[in-house]
Interface confidence: low
């Protein structure tokens, strides 16, 4: 639904003539006619099939219009649709004599006709006013139209019926192209949904109304993220409702028993480590160089002849040092120094001596890596597959195994829209983000180059005199429409002046 | 007036060749496109060729792809369908057809031309 | 390949309506046209692109297509209008016919 509007500004009739070439008499009082109908390639009479209008009398001769909108005027003129726009039009304005007070067309005598023009073409809906003058050898009028929608009435074609609502069913203004824009705090389809408090949690919380938030049973706090421990818990929490987990050092249903001995008491000595095993037991880790139940006694790490192999051992001050004989290393002279001799490389690995055969390398076989090759190559920890890939590890080697839309070895293609030709008649297809595009060759249009396209008889611009060209498609000929005071088949005679004009 | 006119129709035995021709007038003949359909004797209508208004584009049927040849002389005013191979199953009416413009289908056809393949 | 579907045979009385339906995958997004053979004759152009008509063919000839079906309507059937009636479309490979439907006037 919506409005076509034209603007009547200017008509000029010098000479005050009808279109029959007679004078009016004082004047022309002059008053418009406007026929509003489907576009037709020649415009021709019959039903104003999107409506019509008539002014009152505007002036005499020569006159400009008045804007009326402000006042309630009715200029511009008003041609309401109830329809869905269909973007064309033909549009006819005839400029009336009205001898007396009697604008009705049975009131006025035929010859009362001062002058009409007919146009046709493309309009879009929008607030842009289109500006048009039109001459004829005797008369000019000036006038602007446009189309615009009518209230709640949006889109290209004011098809989209949309009302701002504020309620149960939704909370929403209309945006010009007629989608729904929500209310602040609102979302959803229809804008029905409340937008709860920022961070309130999804499954645990919820809202009736904007930057609310309410919480289900078993959890609290003000985004709804705190669950509540059993009705009665002490000294303990939860990570889900109604459960009891204890403190360190509290025990029992209700951890109201308390098990830290160690805070309570400090019974180990020396920097020890203090650990609860059960109600009123506990255990101590000692320091290196104590010993005893609470680490009570100081005792020489080196008793315990911690080196091997012959190392000799001494005592520091937060523990030992072993120094090792030649051939042996290691933090208790454990390891020996080995060679190729020793076969050293597992899993198949090659053995390289270096440095005159005083140490040694490994070459690990696919898929085993380490000093030794001890340790199997796990080929998914680089993450190989592109776009959301996922790694499988198949013996030796790994796959990629891809999202829909995706192929190649990582996964790093894209599955080609235009794989299948789908452009017809040679066209080029272009691979787009979010589908294709076919490029037609001459003689073809449509979206996939499907329609065939002919030779336009009207492209040479045959036709004289600023006259209309169309094409006769069954015949592929032109037809010249002249413009008032031009005849001929291609307009190129003009039309001699009636004998009975005064001067 | 629109018109079009085929002749070379015949009697041709299997394997044998016939040139079909198309004389068009009353109408732009190098602008449009161009087509040839077929009807075997109390059968429907089969589409056999088509050829765009300046000759580059020709499709075929798949029943006569590799046999059947379109082409046209625009100075000519003409159409013509280059018959090889021809099989007992290629008996039919042949009629020349102008295409519209823009998918309009067949608006202007000829009277049609006998083809018989018998041996 | 693409294949239109047509009813072989419609009988209806004189001053009465006619449907004759074409059927295939989609066919609403294809373009549809009609025409007309009456015996002995070449095909008439009735409609094309879906439901227009060219000049010289009368009013009550009128045609639609959506979904999967493309319908001919003959509205007051006169006995001239007996005759085979195609219903055609363009596909990849090239244009398809219709196999064709026998429109008896009773």
């Known amino acids: 639904s919506g409005v076509f509007q034209l603007q009547l500004q200017e008509f000029i009739n010098e000479r005050g003539v009808l279109a029959s070439g007679r004078p009016c008499e004082p004047g022309c009082r002059t008053f418009f006619r406007v026929c509003l109908k489907h576009f037709q390639a020649v415009v021709s009479p019959g039903p104003c099939t999107f409506g019509t209008v008539s002014t009152p009398v505007l002036g005499t001769n020569s006159f400009a219009v008045r804007d009326d909108s402000s006042g309630g005027g009715r200029n511009p003129l008003q041609l309401p649709f109830n329809f869905t726009w269909p973007g064309t039009f033909s549009l006819i304005i005839e400029a009336w004599h009205a001898p007396g007070d009697d604008l009705r067309p049975e009131a006025l005598p035929p010859d009362a006709l001062i002058s009409k023009i007919a146009i046709q073409g493309s309009l879009a809906v929008g607030q842009n006013w289109l500006l048009d003058e039109q001459t004829s050898t005797l008369t000019r009028l000036r006038y602007s139209y446009r189309v615009i929608c009518s209230d709640n009435y949006y889109g290209d074609n004011c098809s989209r019926l949309c009302k701002k609502r504020n309620d149960h069913f939704g909370h929403y203004v209309c945006q010009p192209d007629g989608n729904l824009s929500c209310l602040p705090g609102w979302t959803g389809e229809y804008c029905q949904q409340p937008i709860c408090l920022s961070g309130c949690h999804e499954q645990n919380g919820y809202c009736s109304k904007p930057a609310e938030c309410l919480c289900r049973p078993g959890w609290q706090g003000r985004l709804c993220n705190e669950c509540i421990p059993h009705n009665g818990c002490r000294h303990g929490t939860c990570s889900t409702p109604w459960q009891c987990t204890c403190d360190e050092g509290w025990g029992g249903l209700f951890c109201d028993q308390d098990l830290n001995y160690c805070t309570h008491h400090s019974p180990c000595k020396n920097g020890a480590t203090c650990s609860n095993s059960g109600q009123r037991s506990y255990t101590c880790t000692c320091r290196p160089g104590y010993t005893g139940v609470d680490c009570e006694l100081e005792l020489s790490e080196c008793d315990s002849n911690p080196c091997r192999n012959g190392g000799s051992c001494k005592d520091q001050e937060d523990g030992y040092h072993c120094l090792c004989p030649p051939g042996y290393y290691g933090l208790h002279c454990e390891h020996s120094t080995l060679s190729c001799a020793d076969s050293p490389c597992f899993n198949g690995g090659s053995c390289r001596e270096r440095n005159q055969g005083a140490n040694y390398a490994c070459e690990c076989p696919p898929n085993f890596t380490g000093s030794n090759c001890e340790k199997k190559v796990d080929r998914c920890t680089s993450n190989p597959c592109a776009n959301g890939g996922q790694c499988l590890n198949r013996g030796p080697s790994r796959m990629c195994r891809c999202r829909p839309g995706f192929t190649g070895t990582y996964c790093e293609l894209h599955v080609s829209d235009c794989a299948r030709n789908p452009c017809a008649h040679g066209g080029t297809c272009h691979d787009l983000e979010n589908g294709l595009m076919c490029t037609c060759p001459a003689g073809f249009s449509g979206r996939r180059c499907e329609v065939r396209t002919s030779i336009d008889a009207c492209a040479s611009s045959p036709c004289f005199n600023r006259a209309t060209c169309y094409t006769d498609l069954s015949t592929d000929t032109f037809v010249c429409n002249c413009p008032y005071g031009f005849v001929g088949s291609r307009c190129e005679f003009p039309v001699g002046l009636p004998p009975s004009f005064p001067w | 007036e629109v018109q079009l006119v085929e002749s070379g129709g015949g009697v041709v035995q299997p394997g044998g060749s016939l040139r079909l021709s198309c004389a068009a007038s009353g109408f732009t003949f190098g602008n449009h496109w161009m087509s040839w359909v077929r009807q075997a004797p109390g059968k429907g209508l089969e589409w056999v060729a088509d050829i765009s208004s300046d000759g580059r584009y020709k499709y075929y049927a798949d029943s006569v792809k590799g046999r059947f040849t379109i082409s046209r002389d625009n100075s000519k005013n003409t159409l013509y369908l280059q018959l090889n191979s021809l099989r007992a199953e290629d008996t039919a009416v042949y009629y020349c057809?102008?295409?519209?413009?823009?998918?309009?289908?067949?608006?202007?056809w000829g009277q049609g031309t006998m083809v018989t393949v018998s041996s | 390949s693409y294949e239109l579907t047509q009813p072989p045979s419609v009988s209806v009385s004189p001053g009465q309506t006619a449907s004759i339906t074409c059927s295939a995958d989609?066919?609403?997004?294809?373009?549809v046209s009609w025409y007309q053979q009456k015996p002995g004759q070449s095909p008439v152009l009735v409609i094309y692109q879906d439901g227009m008509r060219p000049s010289g063919i009368p009013e009550r000839f009128s045609g639609s297509n959506s979904g999967n079906t493309a319908t001919l309507t003959i509205s007051g059937t006169q006995a001239m209008d007996e005759a085979d009636y195609y219903c055609?479309?363009?596909?990849?490979?090239?244009?398809?016919f219709g196999g064709g439907t026998k429109l008896t006037v009773l």
């Open positions: 989609n066919l609403g997004n294809q373009y």
């Open positions: 057809a102008k295409a519209g413009g823009g998918n309009v289908g067949f608006d202007i």
């Open positions: 055609q479309a363009w596909d990849w490979s090239g244009e398809v």
